[in-house]
């Protein structure tokens, strides 16, 4: 694989990672594909410090992150352990709400207008954030 030593143009470097913030909206799976085609992944939030950094850049806008439970348990797209990791859900979330009338529950996580997390219908066209780590050889992305 190839090694990244600096962030691409228009990406923001922070704590040895590079972040890219979309201007438009996509369904979660399409946003996931987009990041993968940048040899990156949807943002994985591992600390309060990283949460604040991302929140500062996205503002009060619903924005997808790399967390979903489409196959059962909640999983981060890069394999980071969900159970022991950082979480910032809104009160009473995630709730897998079925009342939206769109079919199914809510399997994809996003930042809400106050930065805290909510689970929502994966087809909603939200903005998204890609992340890639510096000094780490590119490798095949993990399967969902």
């Amino acid at each position: 694989g190839s090694e990244r030593t600096c962030c691409p143009v228009n990406w923001v470097e922070h704590e040895r990672s590079c972040y890219w913030f979309s201007r438009s909206g996509k369904a979660w799976a399409d946003a996931d594909n987009y990041c993968r085609l940048e040899d990156a992944h949807l943002v994985v939030v591992t600390s309060w410090e990283e949460q604040k950094f991302v929140q500062h850049h996205i503002g009060p806008v619903n924005t997808w992150m790399g967390l979903h439970d489409q196959n059962g348990p909640w999983k981060w797209v890069d394999g980071t352990d969900y159970e022991t990791g950082f979480k910032n859900w809104r009160p009473e979330q995630p709730d897998d709400w079925y009342g939206h009338g769109l079919g199914g529950g809510e399997d994809c996580a996003h930042f809400t207008d106050d930065g805290r997390w909510n689970d929502d219908v994966c087809q909603r066209p939200y903005r998204w954030v890609c992340e890639t780590e510096l000094d780490k050889a590119s490798q095949e992305p993990p399967l969902l």
């Epitope: 190839s2 691409p8 940048e38 590119s138």
Partner: antibody, heavy 123, light 107 residues
Framework: QVQLVESGGGVVQPGRSLRLSCAAS????????MHWVRQAPGKGLEWVAI????????FYADSVKGRFTISRDNSKNTLYLQMNSLRAEDTAVYYC????????????????WGQGTTVTVSS | DIQMTQSPSSLSASVGDRVTIACQAS??????LNWYQQTPGKAPKVLIY???NLETGVPARFSGSGSGTDFTFTISSLQPEDIATYYC?????????FGGGTKVDIK
Amino acid sequence: QVQLVESGGGVVQPGRSLRLSCAASGFTFSSYGMHWVRQAPGKGLEWVAIISYAGSTKFYADSVKGRFTISRDNSKNTLYLQMNSLRAEDTAVYYCVRRPPQWLVEGYGMDVWGQGTTVTVSS
Amino acid sequence: DIQMTQSPSSLSASVGDRVTIACQASQDISNYLNWYQQTPGKAPKVLIYDASNLETGVPARFSGSGSGTDFTFTISSLQPEDIATYYCQQYDNLPLTFGGGTKVDIK
């Protein structure tokens, strides 16, 4: 100048394989995603596949999924399309196309096209 | 998949005429649209990207507009060298899809 030159086309029997190559020059190949696009005789354009700049991520049109494989060798500035189990409907001119840099065009755009190489699948 | 419907499929116009081609997407694609020109035996050439941005070196008589689902491509004053087939293409989501093409010729 920026250039993409395809090769490897030819006449092949149904069920057989063929590998197309695309030699890139005039730009930093390893910094760009790449596409293959095809055009059947007298028909419109059809997207075939895309690969990320480091080659770790690939996506395909349903019509070629499981039969075609896109790959790249950044040390040789070359893009490939391995075509297996070829069918008559794969007969087309195949174009190698560069994806513009993300800072210029958000999305899966196309900017520079090669001249194309012709693949004919016939018994 | 996003369907791209282009109209008309062909047109004839006189030199100097204003020519307009429409392209409709089956769902919102924001401004992620290219317009291409293809002459026989040649590769397509990008004229317009992001729906309305003129590619470097392309004459100013070509223009594009629109956002969301409805897009328009215009040649303000048709020239003999503009005889070609024109395609729209969305690059918002995979699979990438093209319009069926519009063949432009001179009356």
